[in-house]
């Protein structure tokens, strides 16, 4: 392009000019040959959506085995390929544990883990690299007022859903409360006055926010009333996505 | 940079070499100045996240006018060009359809569609490429208890807002429930006991989460009580943004 | 698992999370603000404390977030309200609670509601109550736009870093 530019501007160049043109042309060509691929690589490296292959968690596997974290090795359970291998992200869906507990499913239905994110019910969600993450959670609840009581309204119940972090560079100390939501429900008693259970009520407690996390920190959800969680499809989930 | 590089590697260059070096250096610099930005632009244009200008709602404008959405015209409503052409994103705001239905507006007020996202009330929101999307929805509801009834509280109503996907690679079969929120409201009857309508109640049912979507899949909202939707500004919306 | 309380834990207030240097990822404009717990009858947003921060151009001025560059942003906010039970002798009066994120822009002559939630709460007889409102969405914003909040029911806010917050990040 440089040669063409000079030719166009200066007309024919002869003698010593030819050598200069040759040098200029060769230099331009070499520069292009080097600059273009390097620029392509540089731009691709910097475009955040495109960060190359799957990044696996680089935490010390020995330490992991010692702690018995047993993080989920993503089986090829999902038919789809990981659509965005460069982006640490996770979406976990609520699953009932025995004994009225809240567990999380990482591979069924809409659930997934990408780019080195790991999950275990025992330890929570571990993010593979330092960064700014948008964390979110929604817990659906359901219940009925138990029988009895003279008032038309039953005893209130305050439902809380909270997101904590622990471990990693943050240290092994007290887990840190990151985000939480709450809702007080006052169930209606049996409207027919038959002293039976009241009608079913539903509510959802959700939230989301930015948190700066370090590699190896674990994020998990704690809730006040696991026995009232609604595990119907789409109702209860939590997740994280790296945004910076 | 070329000159410095040569100087550093080859020591001092004199006489005719200096001129050649000058030409080479200048050509190299000009070539870099032209090649690098052009390459950057070319690569950015080819990176799949970057698919060009604003795509407006593809719904039949005639049909829309028929529905008489009647949005408030803001001064200089949309002076902006598409601010980030490379990012598939959409924000749709609730609009009343005839017959107590919930429709969505894709271009007025704060609503927008970017980078090949398309919307029609009949088909929902179509995303232009495979990827990881954060989908969100908030539906505001309002109402009052109807007159009558001996109890101080009216009949409970459970409000649900649900996000589904259909079509695309997912197949033409049954739509798939992705995310859902619910809230049971038990309106208070006329406190003065005049058997009139109870006081207005308000609530919102919202959620958001990550979903891996494929190009051509459509996402849409379904709600339980379209007659109770609050269409005041900022109350009812849904959207999607590609995060990876 | 730790007990769930709506007050900041000692651990949380005693030690802040070390600030990150995100060498491996390009910083994007982002902000996460928390309600100032020392101001009980107003909602003042704070940055650079606890887990709150302003990053890559975001600034806080007159209790509003200033958008640093034009683009698409995800904007979110949450508040949590609480209150006491009413006395059995008193007539229960409904309480109106609302929280809104507003945009003030050179393009519009007024504050435009972006995110808005309302709730009528009827306090129960027996227990105190809690109610949270969270909302978030994507918006096309222009450099210099101001994002602010308006809240009804401020005396009922539960001001802690985990319950009352306001943020945005460029996509």
């Amino acid at each position: 392009m440089g040669a063409l530019g000079l030719e166009g501007r200066g007309g024919r160049l002869q003698g010593r000019g030819s050598l200069l043109l040759a040098v200029a042309g060769a230099t331009s060509l070499v520069t292009l040959l080097l600059a273009v691929p390097i620029t392509v690589l540089a731009v691709l490296a910097l475009v955040p959506q495109d960060q190359g292959g799957l990044v696996t968690d680089t935490a010390d596997p020995g330490a992991q085995a010692q702690q018995g974290l047993g993080f989920q090795k993503l089986p090829e359970e999902e038919p789809e390929a990981d659509l965005s291998p460069g982006l640490p992200a996770a979406h976990l869906i609520g699953a009932p544990l025995k004994g009225q507990g809240l567990g999380w499913e990482a591979t069924k239905e809409q659930a997934f883990l990408t780019s080195g994110t790991q999950f275990s019910d025992a330890e929570g969600l571990a993010l593979p690299q330092d960064g700014l993450y948008y964390l979110y959670c929604l817990v659906g609840y359901r219940g009925r007022a138990p029988p009895g009581g003279a008032e038309p309204r039953g005893r209130s119940v305050t439902l809380r859903s909270s997101l904590y972090r622990a471990g990693g560079a943050y240290g092994p100390g007290t887990p840190e409360l990151l985000l939480e939501g709450a809702e007080t429900v006052t169930p209606v008693l049996d409207p027919a006055g038959r002293q039976g259970y009241g009608p079913l009520w539903y509510t959802s407690v959700g939230f989301g926010g930015l948190v700066q996390l370090r590699r190896g920190e674990r994020v998990y959800v704690n809730i006040s009333h696991p026995d009232m969680v609604d595990f119907a499809r789409g109702k209860t989930f939590f997740g994280a996505v790296m945004v910076g | 940079m070329g000159a410095l590089g040569l100087e550093g590697r080859g020591g001092r260059l004199q006489g005719r070499g200096s001129l050649l070096l000058a030409v080479a250096g200048a050509t190299s610099l000009v070539t870099l100045l032209l090649a690098v930005p052009i390459t950057v632009l070319a690569v950015l244009a080819l990176v799949p996240q970057d698919q060009g200008g604003l795509v407006t709602d593809t719904a039949d404008p005639g049909a829309q006018a028929q529905q008489g959405l009647g949005f408030q015209k803001l001064p200089e409503e949309e002076p902006e060009a598409d601010l980030s052409p490379g990012l598939p994103a959409a924000h749709l705001i609730g609009a009343p359809l005839k017959g107590q239905g919930l429709g969505w507006e894709a271009t007025k007020e704060q609503a927008f569609l970017t980078s090949g996202t398309q919307f029609s009330d009949a088909e929902g929101l179509a995303l232009p490429q495979d990827g990881l999307y954060y989908l969100y929805c908030l539906v505001g509801y309002r109402g009052r208890a109807p007159p009558g009834g001996a109890e101080p509280r009216g009949r409970s109503v459970t409000l649900r807002s649900s996000l589904y996907r259909a079509g695309g690679a997912y197949g033409p079969g049954t739509p798939e429930l992705l995310l859902e929120g619910a809230e049971t409201v038990t309106p208070v009857l006329d406190p003065a006991g005049r058997q009139g309508y109870g006081p207005l109640w308000y609530t919102s049912v919202g959620f958001g989460g990550l979903v891996q979507l494929r190009r051509g899949e459509r996402v849409y909202v379904n709600i339980s009580h379209p007659d109770m939707v609050d269409f005041a500004r900022g109350k009812t919306f849904f959207g999607a943004v590609m995060v990876g | 698992l730790p007990g769930v309380g709506l007050t900041p834990s000692a651990a949380q207030t005693a030690r802040q999370h070390p600030k990150m240097h995100l060498a491996h990822s390009t910083l994007k404009p982002a902000a996460h603000l928390i309600g100032d717990p020392s101001k009980q009858n107003s909602l003042l947003w704070r940055a650079n404390t606890d887990r709150a921060f302003l990053q890559d151009g975001f600034s806080l001025s007159n209790n509003s977030l200033l958008v640093p560059t034009s683009g698409i942003y995800f904007v979110y906010s949450q508040v949590v309200f609480s209150g006491k039970a009413y006395s059995p002798k008193a007539t229960p009066t409904p309480l109106y609670l609302a929280h809104e994120v507003q945009l003030f822009s050179s393009q519009y002559p007024f504050h435009v509601p972006l995110l808005s939630s309302q709730k009528m709460v009827y306090p129960g007889l027996q227990e105190p109550w809690l109610h949270s409102m969270y909302h978030g969405a994507a918006f096309q914003l222009t450099q210099g736009d101001q994002l602010s909040t308006h809240t009804d029911g401020i005396p009922h806010l539960v001001l802690s870093p985990s319950t009352v917050f306001f943020g945005a990040f460029a996509l």
Epitope: L69, A95, F119, S120 | - | -
Partner: antibody
Framework: DVQLQESGPGLVKPSQSLSLTCSVT?????????WNWIRQFPGNKLEGMGY???????NYNPSLKNRISITRDSSKNQFFLKLNSVTAEDSGTYYC???????????WGQGTSVTVSS | DIVLTQSPASLAVSLGQRATISCRAS??????????MHWYQQKPGQPPKLLIY???NLESGIPARFSGSGSRTDFTLTINPVETDDVATFYC?????????FGGGTKLEIK
Amino acid sequence: DVQLQESGPGLVKPSQSLSLTCSVTGYSITSGYYWNWIRQFPGNKLEGMGYISYDGSNNYNPSLKNRISITRDSSKNQFFLKLNSVTAEDSGTYYCARDAYSYGMDYWGQGTSVTVSS
Amino acid sequence: DIVLTQSPASLAVSLGQRATISCRASESVDNYGISFMHWYQQKPGQPPKLLIYRASNLESGIPARFSGSGSRTDFTLTINPVETDDVATFYCQQSNKDPYTFGGGTKLEIK
């Protein structure tokens, strides 16, 4: 992919103990889920015998309670069945399976045939 | 224990026709807003294979010819249209209460 494989003796004498091993690959048994033993009698009737949870807790079918023990070795990613005082009625095909909470038993071993006979 | 009663015990259906299998529980298997009822297909010499979870959700990789419905105590597995490959025994199973229990099975044959 997640795979389960049962192993153990195919023939056990009455009154002795039956010991079977389930080896799991592709997923850590301490990560999540419930790890079950199910048996199928010659007439094709299926019986859930019990499970060990990801956290190490157990649950056994009351009909077997005094005879059954399910344990695990996390380092080898294996879990085990021990059934004491076996009789001819304990003959059948023994399967190990992963119970994915409310998502059903999504992965099964191929099964191992056990005959109780002197 | 929750007893699951399957009917019919065997079923002969023509190719391309609909097969319907019923499962009745001795008590409700619903909890937390979902039904803890699952359906399996077992072919000779193979372990059972999960077809439907939570009463009506198709397991990944299972053809849409299989569908499930029902709640609380009454559940149905439907195969429509029946294909040659569907010859097998089908079992319902509940996981709402320990111990897990299975139905007695329904053997499907082609007419």
